[in-house]
């Protein structure tokens, strides 16, 4: 459920990329959310998304337990006591091995029809 009363998230960025983990950063109004709901979905598979939640005061989290050299779509929503925001999504390719850790990857995040590319 989404409502106009709920302020939307700002943007989401993959700050660090490893072969089995990554670090996600996002912006959001201070004090607006109880928690953030994050889904990590391996692209092009029917495998269930990994769900996790992060306290509303945080703007960053590690996402461990990923596969190397794999495309993921990560979706984040802010949740209040009654509502969930429109989701923001980011697509990322994990590194193929230890040498590639933290190398820049092409990131795309979008909310609705807005698309931004970071290189």
């Amino acid at each position: 459920a989404s409502t106009g009363e709920t302020p939307n998230l700002g943007e989401v960025v993959v700050a660090e990329v490893g072969w089995d983990a990554l670090k996600l950063n996002w912006t959001a109004p201070e004090g607006a959310y109880e928690y953030f709901f994050i889904q990590v979905q391996e692209a092009d598979t029917v495998e269930a998304a990994q769900n996790l939640t992060v306290p509303g005061g945080l703007r960053s989290t590690d996402l461990p337990g990923l596969k190397a050299a794999t495309h993921y779509t990560i979706t984040i929503r802010g949740v209040t006591q009654d509502f969930s925001t429109t989701p923001l999504s980011v697509e990322v390719l994990t590194a193929s091995g230890l040498n590639d850790i933290f190398e820049a990857q092409k990131i795309e995040w979008h909310e609705g029809t807005h698309h931004h590319h970071h290189h």
Epitope: F37, T53, D82, S84
Partner: antibody, heavy 121, light 107 residues
Framework: QVQLVQSGAEVKKPGSSVKVSCKAS????????ISWVRQAPGQGLEWMGG????????NYAQKFQGRVTITADKSTSTAYMELSSLRSEDTAVYYC??????????????WGQGTTVTVSS | DIQMTQSPSSLSASVGDRVTITCRAS??????LGWYQQKPGKAPKRLIY???SLQSGVPSRFSGGGSGTEFTLTISSLQPEDFATYYC?????????FGQGTKVEIK
């Protein structure tokens, strides 16, 4: 003060199903996850699965995948856990709980009183 | 699923002893790791959350530590009311997982 009140004890035949309810009161229901945890006699705690009512999607432990279904009715603030193809090893106390770390970051955990399910022919 | 391996499965100790229980995760986890105490016939009671934060109302003799894949619960000076079973719970990545439990008995 959040309260989780579970349905009463059940006696079931092997191969049948059981559905346990958990009614929440005293706080917001839809945004916070409800987990189901079971404990067989003399055994440890097992996390079976959980649901965030606002999203409706449940997560299940691999052990129970395909046999357990967790649902939530936002209109009555009630969560349900249905376990099918029951066997004697499913005899246990089943708890619903609001556990810190999964769509809930409150000062206290909240647990239902437990529902004893006995599977016997 | 992430496996949480808890050790020892049981231990005998005396009042005043220092006791440490360990939980190892099968992969790196976010530090959303809780420790619970359970007494027979009762629901579990949370002692520690976020790996090392002490639950309000819990005596300071209980402490948590660790990060990544290895976590510990320490009771600095065992008291008579501490004889119980202790469980770790990884609840930061779904599905969540409990450790197998550690029964602390009187020597």
């Amino acid at each position: 003060q959040v309260q989780l009140v579970q349905s009463g004890a059940e006696v079931k035949k092997p191969g049948s199903s059981v559905k346990v309810s958990c009614k929440a009161s005293g706080g917001t229901f839809s945004s916070y996850a409800i987990s189901w945890v079971r404990q067989a006699p003399g055994q440890g705690l097992e996390w079976m699965g959980g649901i965030i009512p606002i999203f409706g999607t449940a997560n299940y432990a691999q052990k129970f995948q395909g046999r357990v279904t967790i649902t939530a009715d936002k209109s009555t603030s009630t969560a349900y856990m249905e376990l099918s193809s029951l066997r004697s090893e499913d005899t246990a106390v089943y708890y619903c709980a609001r556990l810190y770390g999964y769509a809930y970051y409150g000062a206290f955990d909240y647990w239902g009183q437990g529902t004893t399910v006995t599977v016997s022919s | 699923d992430i496996q949480m391996t808890q050790s020892p499965s049981s231990l005998s100790a005396s009042v005043g002893d220092r006791v440490t229980i360990t939980c190892r995760a099968s992969q790196g986890i976010r530090n959303v790791l809780g420790w619970y105490q359970q007494k027979p016939g009762k629901a579990p009671k949370r002692l520690i959350y976020d790996a090392y934060s002490l639950q309000s109302g819990v005596p300071s003799r209980f402490s948590g530590g660790g990060s990544g894949t290895e976590f510990t619960l320490t009771i600095s000076s065992l008291q008579p009311e501490d004889f119980a079973t202790y469980y770790c719970l990884q609840n930061g990545l779904q599905p969540a997982t409990f450790g197998q439990g550690t029964k602390v008995e009187i020597k």
